[in-house]
């Protein structure tokens, strides 16, 4: 049905007929996400009329249909202004049961209505800065948080929980004030950690799940994203013991997430959100990643369970295959692995054994090849300085921040970026001493050591002197040509 | 005949192994000597790399060393404001307030009479008034059309602090200083069994013999380029833009017979300034044929290719390109905050409509 016909029907005021028209419009446009310019004015008129009715109140038996129309039109940028008003946002919030209002809603809310209005709010908040501002002013986050806290006591359908969390994600991603509010005033980390535990269906002592079902995966990912939003600019501060305990507990849940697979090939995405959040944990809380008890079949190294570190390494391997969005794909996992390696000798030694095993092939440049080491060394000259730094820093820490060792494994040419940035191009040892880790040389390396060019990091035959056979005068003449060039450049 | 060795044979084998080992050790000593040549145009960030070594390494400059830079800071500050005032004449920019013309005349008088390492309250006042003038600011905003120190705004904005009688330059102040290096500065450093000799070449034709020993057996050249130079307009006495000048030299050095097998470490410096500039000044100023977008990623990658493509021996000669931001010692601390914004943006991008 055309939007003009629906608007005309609306103006008559015959409720059932209008609902029928809306139902027909909804069926036709349920999958429309782009709209025809020709009917833009008609859609705007329809949106205005709908808003007017929305603000006056919708009949219970027609609400879902009307809200579906509003949801469809809220995908259309040209209709956003109509919907993004204080009154219509309040009306939608009331139907979603998240409005902070004086009068409580008497009867238990209709879940279908609640769900539709949540979807409308998600669309509006995602697309309209005005709606974002109004939603923040209306303090929707307060009732949303309250409801998330009720998931243990009351059963809400998966979809309602998902859209609650999605709306929380959008509000915290787009509004720093909401972020702060959820983090501080509403104790968001505790609230969402609890929600995550409930969603994963585990107590921290249990062995990790094998496969997290699809719906739980969806909800867990939303929780992880919200937690990321509210912790990334907050945990840089020193945390007290009480907070540290909470973050450690969250860490144990994230450990489960790293070890679990997600249904429906969403494992990498799920792990990605997990790793992003791990990067926000206070550094002193990362020790939980190494605190898993050893059990049958676990990977043991120096008496420590390395299952989680190994899983993170496997995740890094997978991520290094991508070329798209490289920075956000690899920086978080590299930063988590770097900090684990920096603080825990067993983790550092394990990672070094995996990533920088004793050198055997000294005939190939460190950046050439398909080993993890080669891929990481290639990133050390990446255009994006953030990518370059995380990759170089990781390898540097695996070398116990020893410049000679770093040069040995990566070559001075590749290492120069990090060394320059750290003021280490001329050697020296930074603060952050390491309990001295020994570095074993293979027989192959010892044999070839004399022929290795430290700049390229591989064996190179001594090249013939290009000036062989030249007289001193000729050499001087060539030298002066260069000097003149340098002189011109340095002026 | 069997495979058993007589006692003499065994001794001979041992001797042979020993000789091999000694030869290897001698060879190692020579091979583990790394000769680096540090090159780059003025303001390319070359000297900053050397200063940076000092700041983060060895706990930075001592107070005494910092004090010695006071005169350089003052000189840089005065030279910067003078360069702007001179350019106003050339670019036909008037002072916002006509009274500043007197200050400008006063500036030249006071600057000429200034004692090295001192800045009088009178001189500081003159500079401050001039720097605040809207015409001076307009001229500063066109600094790509004349030669101006990168650190001009840094010092001039901080004049109140710098002009204090008890002023001692900070590490960051020292890092921003600009001194014309001349001749060759040789630095030696050792990484375990690797002996490095770095020659910082500043031009100026010093004694010829000295040069030859610089150029023989160079393991790698560290070549510095200021990315932010791409939009600088030629001074009257220049034939080509400074970026093209750098490329020309890079071409000559990269393909020079002295450096046939010499790897090159290419530092594309001042990426922070470049990132800011590229939003306003298109790359086509320097490369008219450039058809990409004016985003940092695309433009920087293009410049990298322009340099790397000059290498005529791609199979035997390595170029290691590093994008750096030499004056920011803070970006040395390991932080991945830059990524968090991107993560949130992408998580939002992945949110569809319902």
């Amino acid at each position: 049905m055309e939007p003009r016909a629906v608007a005309d029907a609306l103006e008559t005021g015959e409720e059932d007929a209008v609902t029928e028209a809306l139902r027909s419009f909804n069926r036709e446009h349920s999958q429309s996400f782009t709209f025809d310019d020709a009917q833009q004015e008609d859609r705007k008129r329809l949106a205005k009329l709908l808003v007017s009715v929305l603000e006056q109140g919708l009949s219970p038996k027609h609400r879902v249909t009307w809200l579906q129309t509003i949801r469809i039109l809220s995908r259309d940028r040209s209709c956003l202004d109509s919907f993004a008003s204080r009154q219509s946002l309040h009306a939608l919030a009331c139907y979603a049961d998240i409005a902070i209002s004086e009068e409580p809603i008497p009867q238990p809310p209709d879940m279908d209505v609640l769900l539709e209005s949540l979807k409308c709010l998600c669309n509006l908040v995602l697309s309209s800065p005005t709606a974002q501002m109004l939603a923040a002013e209306a303090r929707l986050v307060v009732r949303l948080a309250e409801r998330v806290g009720l998931y243990r006591k009351r059963s809400y359908p998966h979809e309602v929980q998902f859209f609650d969390l999605r709306l929380l994600f959008l509000l915290t991603a787009l509004r720093t004030d909401v972020r702060q509010q959820l983090f501080q005033e509403l104790h968001g980390v505790r609230l969402l950690t609890d929600a995550l535990e409930l969603t994963l269906g585990v107590a921290p002592k249990e062995n990790p799940l094998v496969i997290l079902p699809a719906q739980e995966t969806e909800r867990a990912m939303e929780i992880l994203k919200v937690l990321f939003n509210i912790t990334y600019d907050s945990v840089k501060r020193e945390v007290d013991e009480e907070d540290a305990a909470l973050y450690r507990y969250l860490g144990t849940l994230l450990r489960h997430c790293v070890m679990a697979d997600a249904a429906g090939d969403r494992t990498e995405e799920f792990h990605g959100h997990t790793v992003n959040l791990l990067g926000n944990l206070p550094l002193k809380c990362l020790d939980v990643l190494l605190a898993l008890e050893l059990h049958e079949g676990s990977l043991e190294f120096m008496g420590v369970n390395m299952d989680v570190i190994n899983a993170l390494l496997a995740f890094l391997e997978k991520r290094l295959h991508q070329t798209h969005r490289l920075k956000e794909c690899v920086a978080p996992v590299l930063s988590v692995l770097t900090e684990c390696a920096r603080m825990h000798r067993p983790a550092r030694k394990f990672l070094k054994a995996q990533v920088l095993p004793p050198l055997r092939d000294v005939r190939t440049r460190p950046e050439v090849g398909d080993l993890l080491r080669n891929k990481l060394v290639r990133l050390m000259t990446h255009l994006d300085t953030d990518v370059k730094r995380v990759a170089a820093e990781f390898l540097f820490v695996l070398c116990s921040e020893s410049v000679p060792r770093f040069i040995k494994y990566t070559g001075y040419g590749n290492a120069a970026g990090l060394l320059a940035a750290r003021g280490l191009m001329a050697g020296g040892r930074p603060e952050g001493q390491y309990s001295e880790d020994e570095d074993t040389d293979t027989e192959e390396y010892r044999e070839a050591k004399a022929s290795i060019n430290p700049v390229t990091g591989r064996v190179e035959e001594k090249p013939p002197n290009p000036m062989e056979g030249m007289t001193e005068e000729q050499k001087e003449h060539e030298a002066m040509k260069l000097v003149n060039m340098f002189d011109k450049l340095s002026r | 005949m069997g495979c058993t060795l007589s006692a003499e044979d065994k001794a001979a084998v041992e001797r042979s192994k020993m000789i091999d080992r000694n030869l290897r050790e001698d060879g190692e000593k020579a091979a583990r000597e790394v000769k680096l040549l540090l090159l780059g145009a003025g303001e390319s960030g070359k000297s900053t790399i050397v200063k940076q070594m000092k700041i983060i390494h060895e706990a930075g400059y001592s107070e005494e060393e910092c004090k010695q830079y006071k005169a350089v800071v003052y000189s840089n500050t005065i030279q910067s404001i003078i360069a702007i005032i001179r350019a106003m004449g050339r670019l036909k920019i008037d002072f916002g307030d006509a009274a500043r013309a007197d200050d400008a005349r006063q500036l030249f008088v006071l600057a000429g009479a200034a004692e090295e390492g001192f800045m009088t309250a009178e001189l500081a006042g003159v500079i401050k008034r001039l720097w605040k003038d809207s015409g001076v600011q307009a001229c500063f905003n066109r600094s790509r059309e004349y030669q101006l120190n990168d650190s001009a705004a840094y010092y001039l904005n901080d004049l109140d602090r710098i002009a204090q009688p008890n002023y001692i330059p900070t590490q960051q102040d020292v890092l921003r200083t600009r001194v014309k290096t001349t001749g060759i500065v040789e630095t030696h450093f050792t990484f375990k069994d690797l002996h490095f000799k770095m020659f910082d070449v500043g031009g100026q034709r010093s004694e010829r013999k000295k040069w030859i020993h610089c150029f023989e057996g160079v393991t790698a050249i560290i070549f510095c380029v200021a990315l932010s130079d791409y939009d600088l307009v030629l001074a009257e006495d220049e034939e080509m833009n400074r970026m093209h000048e750098s490329m020309k030299l890079f071409d000559s050095i990269c393909n020079n017979k002295w450096f046939t097998d010499t790897s090159i470490i290419l530092f594309l410096n001042k990426k922070d300034l470049f990132e800011e500039k590229i939003k306003k000044s298109p790359l086509t100023i320097c490369y008219p044929e450039y058809a990409g977008s004016n985003t940092y990623e695309e433009a920087a990658a293009y410049i990298q290719c322009q340099f790397e493509d000059l290498n005529k021996r791609k199979d035997t000669k390595e170029i290691y390109t590093h994008f750096t931001c030499a004056t920011d010692t803070k970006n040395v601390q390991f932080v991945f905050d830059a990524v968090t914004d991107v993560i949130i943006k992408n998580n939002l991008k992945d949110c569809g409509l319902f």
Partner: nanobody, 119 residues
Framework: QVQLVESGGGLVQPGGSLRLSCAAS????????MNWARQAPGKGLEWVST????????SYADSVKGRFTISRDNAKNTLYLQMNSLKPEDTAVYYC????????????RGQGTQVTVSS
């Protein structure tokens, strides 16, 4: 043809009450949303209240909230407006109308009934 006839207006003192009625004919009353609007001397038409077809959803202008109550009796094809705590600023001609919107179509609004609040 659609007919809407308002009644119940009059002169009342501030703080007093009145009950307006609107008799509908010429259409299936029970299917339509109905509204009350008013027009004060020299002013435009102002929406007062709306009620849905089943009578279970009502809404009011902020100026009358808590004092006026809209209701309907579908068996009698009649719309009501109970007005309490009347104020002088409630003085106006009150119209009943069909639908959610203050239509300018003649058949959707009655002739109106005068309400005067004065001491």
């Amino acid at each position: 043809q659609v007919q809407l006839v308002e009644s119940g207006g009059g002169l009342v003192q501030p703080g007093g009450s009145l009950r307006l009625s609107c008799a509908a004919s010429g259409f299936t009353f029970s299917r339509f949303v109905m509204n009350w609007a008013r027009q004060a001397p020299g002013k435009g038409l102002e929406w007062v209240s709306t009620i849905n077809s089943d009578g279970d959803v009502t809404s009011y202008a902020d100026s009358v909230k808590g004092r006026f109550t809209i209701s309907r009796d579908n068996a009698k094809n009649t719309l009501y407006l109970q007005m309490n705590s009347l104020k002088p600023e409630d003085t106006a001609v009150y119209y009943c109308g069909k639908g959610w919107f203050l239509n300018r179509r003649d058949e959707s609004r009655g002739q109106g009934t005068q309400v005067t609040v004065s001491s």
